[in-house]
């Protein structure tokens, strides 16, 4: 999530940032660590069967402002958190799925316990 008072126009970092990556490792990553000029992220979303899937990795500076904003997408439960304060800071991010809305019960898949 963005820090209070952080400007919306992304300013270039003076140095590269290393992030943990999982299910989202680019080709240039090594030992599940990627590099970026932008943000580290951790995201949780539902897969097609309604199971929560956690991915993490690097977001480049270009477009990261939009991607880290976590705008709700209709019919999709997803939450993303971004950070830059230290290397591998996304190890400590634990986004949670937004609560189900009533219409999701109607439109979404039926889960049996």
């Amino acid at each position: 999530k963005k820090e209070d008072g952080e400007s919306t126009a992304p300013t270039p970092r003076p140095k590269i940032l290393r992030c943990k990556c999982h299910h989202h490792c680019p080709e240039d990553s090594v030992n599940n660590i990627c590099s970026t000029d932008g943000y580290c992220f951790t995201m949780i979303e539902e897969d097609d069967s309604g199971m929560p899937v956690v991915t993490s990795g690097c977001l480049g500076l270009e477009g990261s402002d939009f991607q880290c904003r976590d705008t709700p997408i209709p019919h999709q439960r997803r939450s993303i958190e971004c950070c830059t304060e230290r290397n591998e800071c996304n190890k400590d991010l634990h986004p949670t799925l937004p609560p189900l809305k009533n219409r999701d019960f109607v439109d979404g898949p039926i889960h049996h316990k």
């Epitope: 003076p14 140095k15 590269i16 690097c58």
Partner: antibody, heavy 116, light 112 residues
Framework: QVQLQQPGAELVKPGASVKLSCKAS????????MQWVKQRPGQGLEWIGE????????LYNQKFKGKATLTVDTSSSTAYMQLSSLTSEDSAVYFC?????????WGQGTTLTVSS | DVVMTQTPLSLPVSLGDQASISCRSS???????????LHWYLQKPGQSPKLLIY???NRFSGVPDRFSGSGSGTDFTLKISRVEAEDLGVYFC?????????FGSGTKLEIK
């Protein structure tokens, strides 16, 4: 202006360890990575590893894991590289270098001689 | 590890001539951010390397405009339009896209 000060030379015996220093000035020490590079005559440049002084996060070239240990002292804006179990293969010039997305500035290098 | 192959190893030139150095990488240097982290350095005898060009084609501050860099992917070139005496030394290409970062073996620019 940016300066990275390194001792000119070190002479150590085989099997011993040595701690090379690199004192940074002219910029905010924690805002850039510090890298270490080895140069042997006729062998080109070899990247040893890097440390982020803001959180002491390190990345090493697999080849130098167990040989080199990188540390920093932010209070004195100094980076260190300890080299252990020295052999004649470790005789070389060792550079520290300021890194953002590429090496911008290099120290003058420390010539390490391993000899009995 | 990414292998950086520089050619030629030695480049004899006359002062005022154009010089061209090639650098090829064993894999693409396009980073996942879209940047290409390929850089050029000059090392004069008894000195540390100095940055000339960063990210393929950007001249570092204080570097004369007779130095230019070009290329993409795996194939890169450094050109010196009119060689001056102060340009003599060993030129290295370097990549910081893939860990471990690697360097070319160097090209020695010398007087013919």
């Amino acid at each position: 202006q940016v300066q990275l000060q390194q001792p000119g030379a070190e002479l150590v015996k085989p099997g011993a360890s040595v701690k090379l220093s690199c004192k940074a000035s002219g910029y905010t020490f924690t805002s850039y990575w510090m890298q270490w590079v080895k140069q042997r005559p006729g062998q080109g440049l070899e990247w040893i590893g890097e440390i982020d002084p803001s959180d002491s996060y390190t990345l090493y070239n697999q080849k130098f894991k167990g040989k080199a240990t990188l540390t920093v002292d932010t209070s004195s804006s100094t980076a260190y590289m300890q080299l252990s179990s020295l052999t004649s293969e470790d005789s070389a010039v060792y550079f520290c270098a300021r890194f953002g997305y590429y090496i911008e500035y290099w120290g003058q290098g420390t010539t390490l001689t391993v000899s009995s | 590890d990414v292998v950086m192959t520089q050619t030629p190893l030695s480049l004899p030139v006359s002062l005022g001539d154009q010089a061209s150095i090639s650098c090829r990488s064993s894999q693409s240097l396009v980073h996942s951010t879209g940047n290409t982290y390929l850089h050029w350095y000059l090392q004069k005898p008894g000195q540390s390397p100095k940055l000339l060009i960063y990210k393929v084609s950007n001249r570092f501050s204080g570097v004369p405009d007779r130095f230019s860099g070009s290329g993409s992917g795996t194939d890169f070139t450094l050109k010196i339009s009119r060689v001056e005496a102060e340009d003599l030394g060993v030129y290295f290409c370097s990549q910081s896209t893939h860990v471990p970062f690697t360097f070319g073996s160097g090209t020695k620019l010398e007087i013919k």
